[in-house]
């Protein structure tokens, strides 16, 4: 019985729960998901019983080994998986626990602009990056391109201060989660500062 294994999968994808055993006579292998039985295998009997019929097409055993592959992942497959290997040659079952996190592939992040001020030829505002569907575990970074050195900024909010007459700048929000990343449409400082002069709470995609 080893430490808990953390696994990551993406919606629609597949994940393999690794399992090895050198036990000669395995009587049964029982997989459970959040305490609900998932699959029972009797290697000697040659039988594999998937508790819920709808999971049958999603369950596989790569190369005929003990590892369990779960396909067509859904968000609600996230949770705790537990396997027990039962054998008359073992005093107690050999066990392993896994935690699976299933993430969605990120759509294009949306950018909104906060209140803007134009003072002394300087345009000052905040750009906020967010996911429309409230996806979990998203990390945001901003790329600012166009000045002598390209800059990066961590976090969903990017404070902007751009002087009229300076070379134009391009801002791009990058949204990342453990399985994917996506980019906002590029935003030009000149356009942003022009278009926002008369609409202080505008938003852009």
């Amino acid at each position: 019985s080893g430490p808990v294994k953390e696994l990551v999968g993406s919606v629609g994808g597949a994940v393999t729960f690794p399992l090895k055993s050198k036990v000669k006579q395995v009587d049964s292998i029982v997989w459970t998901f959040n305490t609900t039985p998932l699959v029972t295998i009797q290697p000697e009997g040659g039988t594999i019983i998937v508790t819920q019929n709808r999971n049958r097409e999603r369950v596989d055993f790569p190369d005929g080994g003990y590892s369990l592959k779960l396909s067509k992942l859904k968000k609600n497959d996230s949770g705790i998986y537990y396997v027990g290997i039962y054998s008359s040659s073992l005093q107690q079952p050999s066990t392993q626990e896994y935690v699976l996190h299933v993430y969605e592939h990120l759509s294009k992040p949306k950018v909104t602009m906060g209140l803007q001020s134009n003072k002394n030829g300087t345009c000052v505002t905040n750009l906020t990056c967010c996911m429309e569907h409230g996806e979990e575990d998203v990390i945001y970074t901003w790329k600012a391109l166009g000045q002598a050195a390209n800059e990066s900024h961590n976090g969903s909010i990017l404070p902007i201060s751009w002087r009229w007459g300076e070379s134009d700048m391009t801002f791009i929000c990058v949204a990342r989660n453990p399985v994917s990343r996506n980019f906002s449409s590029p935003i030009l400082a000149r356009k942003l500062c022009e278009g926002a002069a008369d609409d202080p709470d505008s938003s852009m995609v």
């Epitope: 055993s21 050198k22 000669k24 295998i41 290697p43 000697e44 009997g45 040659g46 039988t47 594999i48 049958r56 055993f61 190369d63 005929g64 080994g65 003990y66």
Partner: antibody
Framework: QVQLVQSGAEVKKPGASVKVSCKAS????????MNWVRQAPGQCLEWIGR????????KYNAKFKGKATLTADKSTSTAYMELSSLRSEDTAVYYC?????????????WGQGTLVTVSS | DIQMTQSPSSLSASVGDRVTITCKAS??????VAWYQQKPGKAPKLLIY???YRYTGVPDRFTGSGSGTDFTLTISSLQPEDFATYYC??????????FGCGTKVEIK
């Protein structure tokens, strides 16, 4: 990758013995069952028996008890099948085949086969 | 010993055809049936185990089904490389494991 390589064809006289070898590579030889299967000309496939190299435990089809002896050498990852008191009806291709872990009676990797011809 | 009766013993089909091979066990073997493909001069190749589990790398046009005593191997759309002999095998509990006598799939 998993490979099972068997010894070459043999021609034997009735009453003689023959020992066929099967060298395994690419997996944990000691902890997988190794099966032996016979295919005689125009006959169905027949399961002879299997051996667990880890402890040399062998199980036989009753039909082949006394005819076949299965052994394994862990140090060279080689399984052997010896056939004794050969008769013309023992003429066949003999295969070694590894058991899958998840269903030990299903065989996923096979040797290329060894033709044993028994003829006077 | 458990007998495995396979039918038909041979069949002729064309590329693209749907082909069904059946296997009947002489007693209940639960879902412990494997299917193999064999080409002349070659060793058998595992296609399906535990009645319906496709072995890694086997194309999804091969489907196994059944439980108890009646089992089926279906090839949904026959490809040129599928012309071969197919064997069922029961791998239920205590050996001996037994095979059907094969179905030869030939070109029509």
């Amino acid at each position: 990758q998993v490979q099972l390589v068997q010894s070459g064809a043999e021609v034997k006289k009735p009453g003689a013995s023959v020992k066929v070898s099967c060298k395994a590579s690419g997996y944990a030889f000691s902890s997988s069952w190794m099966n032996w299967v016979r295919q005689a000309p125009g006959q169905c496939l027949e399961w002879i028996g299997r051996i667990y190299p880890g402890d040399a435990d062998a199980k036989y089809n009753a039909k082949f008890k006394g005819k076949a002896t299965l052994t394994a050498d862990k140090s060279t990852s080689t399984a052997y099948m010896e056939l004794s008191s050969l008769r013309s009806e023992d003429t066949a291709v003999y295969y070694c085949a590894r058991s899958t872990m998840i269903a030990t009676g299903a065989m996923d990797y096979w040797g290329q086969g060894t033709l044993v011809t028994v003829s006077s | 010993d458990i007998q495995m009766t396979q039918s038909p013993s041979s069949l002729s089909a064309s590329v693209g055809d749907r082909v069904t091979i059946t296997c009947k066990a002489s007693q209940d073997v639960s879902t412990a049936v494997a299917w193999y493909q064999q080409k002349p001069g070659k060793a058998p190749k595992l296609l399906i185990y535990s009645a319906s589990y496709r072995y890694t790398g086997v194309p999804d046009r091969f489907t196994g089904s059944g439980s108890g005593t009646d089992f089926t191997l279906t090839i949904s759309s026959l490809q040129p490389e599928d012309f071969a002999t197919y064997y069922c095998q029961q791998h239920y509990s205590t050996p001996p494991y037994t095979f059907g006598c094969g179905t030869k799939v030939e070109i029509k």
